[in-house]
């Protein structure tokens, strides 16, 4: 959808961009798969949750993830990642109180239960990418991506513009 | 600069189906993350909300009106349409087209809306 | 459903002048899910602000809103010209979204 030289521009100013409001603009309840169509699970283990990437058993039902769209201040790309010309950014949210954070020191992603406003953690900028793909890029640490490493997921960084369309970044989001 | 514009007969006869379609331009229904719904007005009154839907196919409906609503999507006109049966007098009024941000309530796992892009309005009268 | 009740019903106010307008909610919602649309005579309404206090595009900082819980207010701080019309509120906080019955605001 874009180089990395426009990557880079484009999330140069991410860590003083502000969300324009504090509301969502709107909501999206889809199930989250990986490019190669595992599953993103989470389960409730010891009173904390715990993400895993799986292959489904056929009819087992997908776990959902309510996606909240939220509008930045600062304009989007080129490549029509954003509304009104401002870019976006997304929480995920797979229960009610929880939401998907970036924990940059361990490059892992996790699940806090935490009260709104949300920290920048929760936030991530959503890329629309190549066959209905999208990706998560962290507020708090541009170039770096919710990714796939050994069946977790985890932060990816990104430096080239080859590792950009890289699959175990890419994400699709379905209604079933 | 998206623009939404209803169309569809002005006068419907009681009993019969009121149908009406909404065609978007200057952005796609399809890859859009808003929603799109129906909203009513009668002469000199309020606002009534009908239903909404997603790109997808699914739908929202207004319960007071659930059972003689259907909404449908055309992503390939970029169009979506609304259908009520049974129409009264009490449908007269303005309908109004309009892109919708969906929020959802985990209480009672349902989704809500509010309307950020309208249609012009087309005024639909029920009389014999 | 919540019933949301707008006051006054109608507002006679001078261009400069700052006008209030208030909307209560049936029920307390913590979400502060709500919206305040604009609407003049003949034409569709126009959305003003969403979650209570975001503007929405393109719409002037004279428009402010706030509240939360069951009291929401529509504040506009210098009445232009352009600005008499009637105004509705609305909450999605919850299925089925209602609207309030309107405020008009008139030329005094």
């Known amino acids: 959808a874009f180089g990395i030289s426009g990557v880079q521009k484009y999330t140069r100013a991410l860590h003083d961009s502000s969300i324009t409001g504090i509301s969502p603009i709107t909501e999206y309840l889809a199930s989250l798969s990986t490019y190669n169509d595992q599953s993103i699970t989470f389960a409730l283990e010891d009173e904390s949750y715990e993400i895993y990437v799986e292959d489904l058993k056929k009819d087992e039902k997908k776990d959902k993830v309510l996606l909240s769209y939220y509008e930045s201040q600062h304009p989007s790309n080129e490549s029509g990642d954003g509304v009104d010309g401002k870019m976006l950014m997304v929480t995920l949210s797979p229960t009610k109180d929880f939401w998907l954070h970036a924990n940059n020191k361990e490059h892992s992603v996790e699940l806090h239960k935490c009260e709104k406003p949300l920290p920048d953690q929760a936030f991530f900028v959503l890329h629309n990418m190549h066959s209905n793909c999208v990706s998560f890029e962290c507020k708090t640490d541009p170039g770096v991506f919710i990714g796939v490493k050994d069946n977790h997921l985890a932060l990816i960084k990104v430096d080239s513009s080859e590792n950009l369309c890289t699959e175990n970044i890419l994400f699709k989001l379905s209604e079933t | 600069q998206l623009q939404l514009q209803e169309s569809g007969p002005g006068l419907v006869k009681p009993s019969e189906t009121l149908s009406l379609t909404c065609t978007v331009s200057?952005?796609?229904?399809?890859?859009?993350?808003?929603?799109w719904g129906w909203i009513r007005q009668p002469p000199g009154k309020g606002l009534e909300w009908i239903g909404s839907i997603y790109y997808s196919g699914r739908t929202y409906y207004n319960p007071s009106l659930k059972s003689r609503v259907t909404i449908s999507v055309d992503t390939s006109k970029n169009q979506f349409s609304l259908m009520l049966t049974s129409v009264t007098a009490a449908d007269t009024a303005v309908y109004y087209c309009a892109r919708a941000g969906g929020l959802y309530n985990w209480n009672d796992e349902s989704f809500s809306f509010y309307m950020d892009v309208w249609g012009n309005g087309t005024t639909v009268t029920v009389s014999s | 459903e919540i019933v949301l009740t707008q006051s006054p019903g109608t507002l006679s106010l001078s261009p400069g002048e700052r006008a209030t307008l208030s909307c209560r909610a049936s029920q307390s919602f913590s979400s502060s899910y709500l919206a305040w649309y604009q609407q003049k005579p003949g034409q569709a309404p126009r959305l003003l602000i969403y979650g209570a206090s975001s503007r929405a595009t393109g719409i002037p900082d004279r428009f402010s809103g706030s509240g939360s819980g069951t009291d929401f207010t529509l504040t506009i701080s210098r009445l232009e010209p352009e600005d008499f019309a009637v105004y509705y509120c609305q909450q999605y906080d919850r299925s089925p979204l209602t609207f309030g019955g309107g405020t008009k605001v008139e030329i005094k």
């Open positions: 200057g952005g796609s229904i399809r890859s859009s993350i808003f929603y």
